[in-house]
């Protein structure tokens, strides 16, 4: 059954309540310099209402704090609203390291990034940190690497090991979750100049991660025992037409292109999807293609192979797909599948269909293929036209979460967080922020925070509250001492 | 800022062979990027010819392959187009540019050489 | 090799005018395509690339647009400086190949 009634239950004590930002761009100057200025100034208030230095006397300043950048404090300020207790967002790339080596590294940008993880935590909230984070209109990465063929160059793979690794090193001891890649099975919108170059760059991609995980593994785990993966974009997908079988395959192989992609070297093979190679190989061999996915070496396969240590999935969706047999040598083409928008569903304005028990289903399909692991929903919202009373996305929330609550509760699903996106909207971009692109809060955030202080949908009597061991597991000392390091 | 300059004769005889190039500035030739040839005819249509990459790789248009060879020196950040045995019908002005096809701007000749008119004659 | 068509050959438009340039490609190229403005005895320069992307220091005037086979480009309140021959060239599969041109005149 596609829908099933509403369930009373809560979600466990350890679980992330989140929210996600995208690239977090890093303010180059604290923007309250009033308090490094030593000297002493009188006000001519009523002559010229300058101000005048007073020679000879100079005063204690005192040293620059975190809250001096504005960008942070509005930050706190709209988080604290929200209640959560974590904050995925992501780094600059190009901006901690504008040349793509460790030749020039932006020591003001990693301060800023630093004081929002540490100022977050003093608000009890943890951060989730994206190394990368590339949109459709700009790849983010450094220029150098930028014009050197980007992701189809295999040395940028090293180069983001090299980011990474600073990265880990900088701010590691306060940072548990870690992303390195969010949505790489998304950059086929950008490397579609042909299919071979969607598959090496995606290749270069894996292969980057894969790199990145090993180095923390190795360097990085022992001391800051935190956990990296990568986040997947991981829309469910359903047959337009059920009762037809070429629908049905076409919905499984919607998964296999967009999902199994990446999941399948990372978290089972080392290499890619049998399902998804032959079916390429298939249509090269008729002449619908020149496509074929990379052969994967023994030695790429033990580097690709295990290198997560949860799974991360960004979910907002559920497409309706049927097969329809493309020519071209495109991945687009080379997955024969047509996408159908079904117009009595609710939908957003940007047309994503609200569908809840699309997120039941992934969630299940993924723990079948991929064993049980834990997962998180790294970011999952919709886009809403309403500044203030925010329906859309209170009903989107409230439905999404009965059916993740239903994953973890009657499917056993090792679900263990969830974080909606996302914190503020940015201008003449669809609307899916809690709030508007000047910091004015919607009607969502006090749903959200119901759900979060209920810990899901709980019976009349139970309790909401967890031990406080469960709930700050954090060693407060060592919390203390880490937020005093310059 | 990145400047292309070229240099080469403006004319040459029948099955000679016609050497341009085109000296960068402002930019490493070895950094980035794609370099290119592209000529335009006395009627103005315009011809992509071939380049060479930041990292000395190749590609010639197909219906010149055979005719066409472009290096670099790295030392002195030149690129050099050679063509073979040239005919009336190479006669036109010939351009150097900076591609990047795989960044922002996409597929695109952002900076071009100042032109170098060429006419093949006896 | 991937055929350009552009369309119309030559233009004549009054200052302040909004004028527009079409190009049709032989195949679909998705967004992969670029405009210059080449004008009289001067070298072709980048105007606008993946169909719609406007280059660094190009007026906000100029406006590209169009996926898969057909394309435009939009001037809107013409300029004198705006007289020249303009060329699209698709960037999706090697060769890169260019549209004839079409060249605008003033009235």
């Known amino acids: 059954k596609e829908s099933t009634p509403d369930v009373q239950g809560q979600f466990p004590c350890d679980f992330s309540w989140g929210v996600t930002e995208s690239v977090l761009k890093p303010e180059s100057v604290a923007s309250s310099p009033q308090f490094s200025d030593p000297h002493l100034y009188v006000w001519n208030a009523t002559g010229n209402r300058l101000l005048h230095r007073v020679e000879g006397v100079r005063l204690k300043t005192r040293p620059a704090q975190c809250t001096d950048f504005v960008n942070i404090k509005k930050q706190l300020e709209m988080l604290a609203r929200m209640k959560v207790t974590h904050y995925r967002f992501a780094l600059d790339w190009a901006s901690v390291l504008p040349t793509g080596n460790l030749s020039a590294v932006n020591r003001q940008a990693l301060r800023y990034y630093r004081c929002v993880v540490s100022e977050g935590l003093k608000l009890g909230i943890s951060a989730m940190v994206t190394l990368y984070y590339p949109t459709h209109a700009h790849l983010g990465l450094p220029e150098p690497l930028l014009h050197a063929d980007g992701w189809l160059n295999p040395s940028t793979a090293e180069a983001f090991q090299a980011y990474a690794g600073l990265c880990f090193q900088e701010l590691g001891d306060l940072v548990k979750l870690w992303i390195t890649i969010n949505e790489p099975n998304r950059l086929s919108d950008i490397y579609n100049r042909s299919g071979n170059d969607t598959y090496g760059a995606a290749h270069n991609l894996l292969v980057a991660h894969a790199l990145a995980w090993r180095l923390y593994d190795r360097q990085f785990r022992p001391s800051q025992r935190g956990a990296v993966s990568l986040s997947l974009h991981a829309d469910w997908a359903e047959p337009a037409n059920p009762y037809a079988d070429s629908h049905w395959r076409a919905a499984e192989r919607f998964l296999q292109f967009e999902i199994a992609w990446f999941a399948e070297p990372l978290f089972k093979t080392g290499d890619y999807p049998a399902a998804m190679r032959e079916y390429i190989a298939s249509k090269h061999r008729r002449g619908l293609s020149s496509s074929a996915l990379p052969r994967l070496t023994e030695a790429e396969r033990r580097l690709l192979k295990g290198t997560v240590d949860f799974c991360a999935l960004n979910h907002f969706t559920t497409r309706f797909v049927m097969h329809e047999q493309l020519a071209g040598s495109r991945y687009d083409s080379d997955r024969d599948i047509q996408f159908l928008q079904d117009i009595t569903r609710l939908s957003s304005p940007t047309r994503l269909a609200v569908i809840p028990w699309g997120v039941r289903k992934l969630l299940r399909w993924v723990r079948r293929n991929y064993g049980d692991m834990d997962i998180y929903i790294t970011a999952s919202g919709i886009d809403d036209q309403a500044l203030e009373d925010d329906r859309l996305r209170k009903y989107y929330l409230g439905k999404y979460l009965q059916e993740v609550l239903k994953a973890y509760l009657i499917d056993k699903v090792r679900i263990k967080g969830y974080y909606a996106f996302k914190l503020a909207e940015e201008k003449s971009k669809p609307r899916f922020g809690f709030f508007t692109s000047d910091f004015k809060a919607k009607s969502s955030i006090q749903f959200y925070n119901k759900v979060i202080s209920s810990r899901g949908f709980p019976f009349e009597n139970s309790s909401s509250r967890c031990s406080q061991t469960q709930e700050n597991t954090e060693c407060t000392v060592c919390l203390f001492l880490v937020q005093k390091k310059p | 800022e990145v400047q292309l300059q070229q240099s080469g004769p403006g004319l040459v005889k029948p099955s000679q062979s016609l050497s341009l190039t085109c000296s960068v500035t402002g930019y490493s030739i070895t950094s980035g990027y794609y370099w290119t040839w592209i000529r335009q005819f006395p009627g103005n249509k315009l011809e992509w010819m071939g380049y060479?990459?930041?990292?000395?790789?190749?590609y010639y248009n197909p219906s010149l392959r055979n005719r066409i060879s472009i290096t670099r020196d790295t030392s002195k950040n030149h690129f050099f187009l050679k063509f073979y045995s040239v005919t009336a019908e190479d006669t036109a002005t010939y351009f150097c540019?900076?591609?990047?096809?795989?960044?922002?701007?996409?597929?695109?000749?952002?900076?071009w050489g100042q032109g170098t008119s060429v006419t093949v004659s006896s | 090799d991937i055929v350009m068509t552009q369309s119309p050959s030559s233009l004549s438009a009054s200052l302040g005018d909004t004028i527009t340039i079409t190009c049709h490609a032989s195949?679909?190229?998705?967004?992969?395509l670029s405009w210059y403005q080449q004008k009289p005895g001067n070298v072709p320069q980048l105007l606008i690339s993946k169909s719609s992307i406007l280059h660094t220091g190009v007026p906000s005037r100029f406006s590209g647009g169009g996926s898969g086979t057909g394309f435009t480009l939009t001037i809107s309140s013409l300029q004198p400086e705006d007289i020249a021959t303009y060329y699209c060239?698709?960037?999706?599969?090697?060769?890169?190949?260019f549209g004839s041109g079409t060249k605008l005149k003033i009235k």
């Open positions: 195949q679909d190229i998705d967004v992969w």
């Open positions: 060479i990459k930041y990292d000395g790789g190749n």
């Open positions: 540019a900076r591609g990047d096809y795989y960044a922002s701007p996409y597929g695109a000749m952002d900076s």
């Open positions: 060239q698709q960037g999706l599969s090697y060769p890169f190949t």
